[in-house]
């Protein structure tokens, strides 16, 4: 029960006080008691419940006609059952007794009022009155947790605007309101109560730039909203009529959790006594609601796809046809960014990551825009953000970034359990250097901080700086599976490729050619690849780098060897000993449910079939997956990327609610 104020009573004159329903009010009957008195009794109106405890140990007793010793160990508390119809209509009489004096009476006139700030603390999507419910001032995780949730209003419901909805002080329409969380102030007071009292809604100065509160004012024809709290206004005096009244507020978050903001926002209503104009207003009562800002959540390859994005560039029509066919098979919407908008930047995966935010009443996809800011710079803002599609970005917008700040270097695992700890939304994966040096690359700290601050998908740092491009999607992917953990981790594997090529040579296919059928590309015989000492050394180094990540992933995702599939792949070390795929990198695939769009490796054709394709199909088809090999050689591969790099996917949010987990 909420804490009320302390009321001191005195026999000299009647005391007038306000008691808020649902609060426990302390009654000080000792400090002004007549000197010779040694005991007291209390009588109260039917609407008042008096509890007397004499301790220690505390012996609780509701009042009757008993007398109690007048000593500091006696605690008297009041609660009120009903709101008053008129000021001071509930009475408490304290009678003081002494051995030689007649009883002395002290009178307390109480006004019972109902004041409660209600939000969806039970996370049902509905605001229920919270009187005598759990403490709203704490926010707890887990299925038995409680506490309200706010969404960052980061979409753009007004198509004529270039800004996010949370960047203005207006409520556009009911669509905009649905992105906000409802908070209701319920009051029940005597008619004249607010002539001597005021209600103030306020937020801590440290949080005022993270939230905006609109008050709904109901007119005869329509409902209008005006801003009452926000970056410029930490407090607002409310004009509340006496009697029974409900006031609706709509709350939007303005910022995602981050290093300097844990994501909690407390809104408080304070009841002030303004009866004495000569004196400052005095606080009579406070009620608070704590909101947590919903985190930005990534979706893994195991979530059903809903929309595929790709770019139209010079001569990639065949690639787009393949992606279109795949999207149709997976029943996905397809969005193509035209040449005039992508400015010859085809790397859709690198520009953005599509996740979502969720409150009990609303789920919203949100695009996380990377700071790489190349030709696709405007695409997330202009073409992705819109009505019910949010936007967020982090990191420097002009320079100061590396290749590791592109979102091919940002992935998320499917849900996992690691040594008994559950990650029901998976874990974020991003690449880094293995130690800092003069020229090592790392994901910008602002991005790392943002990802960690979301709390629900604890990030894992992998080692990717050994790659020329440096992205984790160059050596790993996840595919859905019907058994075990519900997925498999795919890892690029030079060892597996050498094994395959050696087997083919042993069977007399050493003359078979890699890159056959690719114009202007020097073809390589299996036997020459196997005998090239430098290439072997390069791949031995790459294998060590991937094995480092393999062990890290096994440890951090709780995987066993049987959860991992090795995809045959060779690399070569280029300038500054950075690795690139030797042939199209098959692990860099587009995963649309059971339909996989895999870079066509142009491996040696043996008995009419590419042995690399055959091997991959034999590994993935038993899981119910369908492999489509897409020719991306000249349009993507030789430009240092593949199918996954050139596409992006919006996926269905998890059915698991993030607030039910314990980070």
């Amino acid at each position: 029960m909420a804490q009320g104020t302390l009321i001191r009573v005195t026999p000299e004159q009647p005391t007038h006080a306000v008691c808020v329903l649902g609060t426990l009010t302390q009654l000080d009957i000792c400090s002004s008691a007549p000197e010779d008195c040694t005991s007291f009794s209390i009588n109260a109106s039917p609407g008042v419940v008096v509890d007397i405890a004499h301790g220690p140990p505390a012996k609780k007793k509701s009042t009757g006609s008993s007398t109690w010793p007048l000593d500091p160990g006696v605690e008297v508390t009041l609660t009120m059952k009903v709101a008053s119809g008129s000021t001071g209509d509930q009475k408490v009489q304290i009678s003081y007794y002494g051995p030689k004096t007649p009883p002395v009476k002290a009178l307390l006139y109480l006004t019972g009022v109902e004041i409660s700030l209600c939000a969806d603390i039970t996370r049902t999507g509905k605001v229920k009155p919270t009187r005598a419910v759990k403490d709203q001032r704490t926010w707890t995780w887990g299925p038995c947790g409680q506490g309200a949730i706010l969404l960052v209003n980061c979409d753009r419901d007004n198509l004529e605007s270039s800004a996010m909805d949370c960047e203005d002080d207006e409520v556009l329409d009911s669509e905009d309101l649905q992105d906000m969380s409802l908070m209701t102030l319920s009051t029940k007071t005597p008619k004249d109560f607010f002539t001597n009292h005021t209600l103030v809604l306020h937020v801590a100065r440290s949080e005022m730039d993270k939230v905006r509160v609109f008050q709904a004012t109901r007119g005869k024809l329509s409902s209008k909203c005006s801003v009452v709290l926000g970056p410029k206004w930490p407090s607002h005096y409310l004009m509340v009529p006496g009697g029974k009244h409900n006031m609706d507020f709509y709350v939007e978050a303005l910022a995602f959790p981050d290093t300097d903001f844990p994501g909690l926002i407390t809104l408080t209503i304070s009841l002030l006594d303004t009866s004495n104009l000569e004196l400052p207003e005095a606080v009579v009562f406070q009620d608070s609601v704590v909101f947590r800002v919903a985190p930005w959540i990534m979706t893994p390859n195991t979530q059903p796809p809903q929309e595929v994005y790709a770019c139209s560039i010079f001569e990639n029509e065949d690639f787009l046809k393949s992606v279109t066919t795949l999207a149709m098979k997976a029943k996905c919407k397809l969005t193509i960014c035209p040449e005039e908008e992508n400015m010859d930047d085809q790397w859709m995966q690198d520009e953005m990551e599509i996740g979502y935010i969720q409150a009990p009443h609303k789920t919203l996809p949100v695009v996380f825009d990377s700071p790489r800011n190349r030709g696709l710079k405007e695409f997330p803002i202009k073409r992705v953000m819109g009505p019910d599609f949010g936007y967020v970005t982090r990191g420097p917008q002009t320079g100061g970034i590396s290749g590791l700040d592109s979102f091919g270097n940002l992935e998320v695992s499917p849900p996992v359990t690691v040594r008994g700890k559950e990650y029901p939304l998976g874990r974020i994966l991003f690449g880094d250097s293995c130690y800092p040096s003069n020229d090592s690359r790392q994901m910008h700290q602002a991005l790392q901080d943002f990802l960690s601050a979301q709390q629900v998908q604890a990030p894992v740092k992998l080692y990717s700086d050994w790659l020329s491009v440096g992205h984790v999607d160059e050596f790993l992917s996840f595919v859905p599976a019907p058994d075990r953990k519900g997925f498999r981790l795919l890892l690029a594997s030079p060892r597996s490729c050498y094994k395959l090529f050696q087997e083919q040579q042993n069977e007399g296919h050493g003359e078979a050619l890699l890159f056959e059928g690719i114009k202007k590309k020097k073809q390589q015989k299996i036997k020459n690849i196997l005998s090239n000492k430098t290439l072997r050394e390069h791949n031995s180094f790459v294998e060590r780098c991937i094995d480092w990540n393999r062990e890290l992933l096994k440890r951090e995702l709780g995987l066993a060897e049987s959860d991992i599939i090795d995809i045959p792949q060779l690399f070569k070390l280029k300038e500054f000993s950075k690795a690139e795929a030797f042939f199209p990198n098959m692990v860099n695939m587009l995963v649309l449910g059971k339909h996989l769009g895999i870079p066509k490796p142009f491996g040696p054709v043996i008995n009419g079939r590419c042995c690399l394709e055959e091997k991959v199909c034999s590994l993935l088809e038993p899981l119910g997956l369908q492999c489509t090999f897409i020719n991306d050689f000249f349009t993507y591969h030789i430009r240092h990327g593949e199918v996954h790099c050139g596409t992006n996917v919006r996926r269905k949010p998890f059915s698991f609610k993030w607030w039910n987990m314990v980070p």
Epitope: S402, D439, S468, K521, N528, K572, L573, E575, F576, F582
Partner: antibody
Framework: QVQLVESGGGLVKPGGSLRLSCAAS????????VSWIRQAPGKGLEWVSF????????YYADSVRGRFTISRDNAKNTVYLQMNSLRAEDTAVYYC?????????????????????WGRGTLVTVSS | QSALTQPRSVSGSPGQSVTISCTGT?????????VSWYQQHPGKAPKLIIY???ERPSGVPDRFSGSKSGNTASLTISGLQAEDEADYYC???????????FGGGTKLTVL
């Protein structure tokens, strides 16, 4: 064959900044590794910085690391060298140079380490 | 002080051969075959004449040849011609914190 033209040089006070540009014509710069090399008056060549063709990694000489930033805008066919906190010893002719990326060998021959196309250079003078 | 050491100057008569040495360490010339040579005429930009120790770009006469032994690379110019008079610089990839090093340059005078 690609042609390179540097611009952006000039006189600047110590502690000041300049941004040099290297614009390419005759070919797409995105196919090339690009380096900046400088030559102080009457002195030898000094390698300054490098960016790979995919614009995914960069390298710097010890003498400029933390003060200079190389970047490229493939859409504009241009590579930049942002020079901050300039010192008198940065006075030099700055050359932009490039090498085509070799994609056909089994193992890369190291074309990022040499420069087969050079611009004419732009003079940067740091003096109070 | 340059990281790779070259003689300040060499000279030769037309038709003769000259060799310019470039000495590094086990961490650069000795470790990598990424040694290149540049020719620079006064007031002009440098021009690549040898790469990967001994390879010649197209258009460079075969009078120019490169080699390497241990930590030292060499440029040999045979059949010297007047137009060969220029400054010559060697360069190598290095595993040091500055990944590309140049020599201090050698002035070739054709007598």
């Amino acid at each position: 064959q690609v042609q390179l033209v540097e611009s952006g040089g000039g006189l600047v006070k110590p502690g000041g900044s300049l941004r040099l540009s290297c614009a390419a014509s005759g070919s797409t710069l995105s196919d090339y590794f690009v380096s900046w090399i400088r030559q102080a008056p009457g002195k030898g060549l000094e390698w300054v910085s490098f960016v790979n063709s995919a614009d995914t990694f960069t390298y710097y000489a010890d003498s400029v690391r933390g003060r200079f930033t190389i970047s490229r805008d493939n859409a504009k066919n241009t590579v930049y060298l942002q020079m901050n906190s300039l010192r008198a010893e940065d006075t030099a002719v700055y050359y932009c140079s490039s090498a085509t990326e070799e994609v056909d060998d089994i193992v890369a021959p190291g074309r990022g380490y040499y420069m087969d196309v050079w611009g004419r250079g732009t003079l940067v003078t740091v003096s109070s | 002080q340059s990281a790779l050491t070259q003689p300040r100057s060499v000279s030769g008569s037309p038709g003769q051969s000259v060799t310019i040495s470039c000495t590094g360490t086990r961490g650069d010339v000795g470790r990598y075959n990424h040694v290149s040579w540049y020719q620079q005429h006064p007031g002009k930009a440098p021009k690549l004449i040898i790469y990967n120790v001994y390879e010649r770009p197209s258009g460079v006469p075969d009078r120019f040849s490169g080699s390497k032994s241990g930590n030292t690379a060499s440029l040999t110019i045979s059949g010297l011609q007047a137009e060969d008079e220029a400054d010559y610089y060697c360069s190598s990839h290095s595993r040091s914190s500055t990944p590309v090093l140049f020599g201090g340059g050698t002035k070739l005078t054709v007598l």
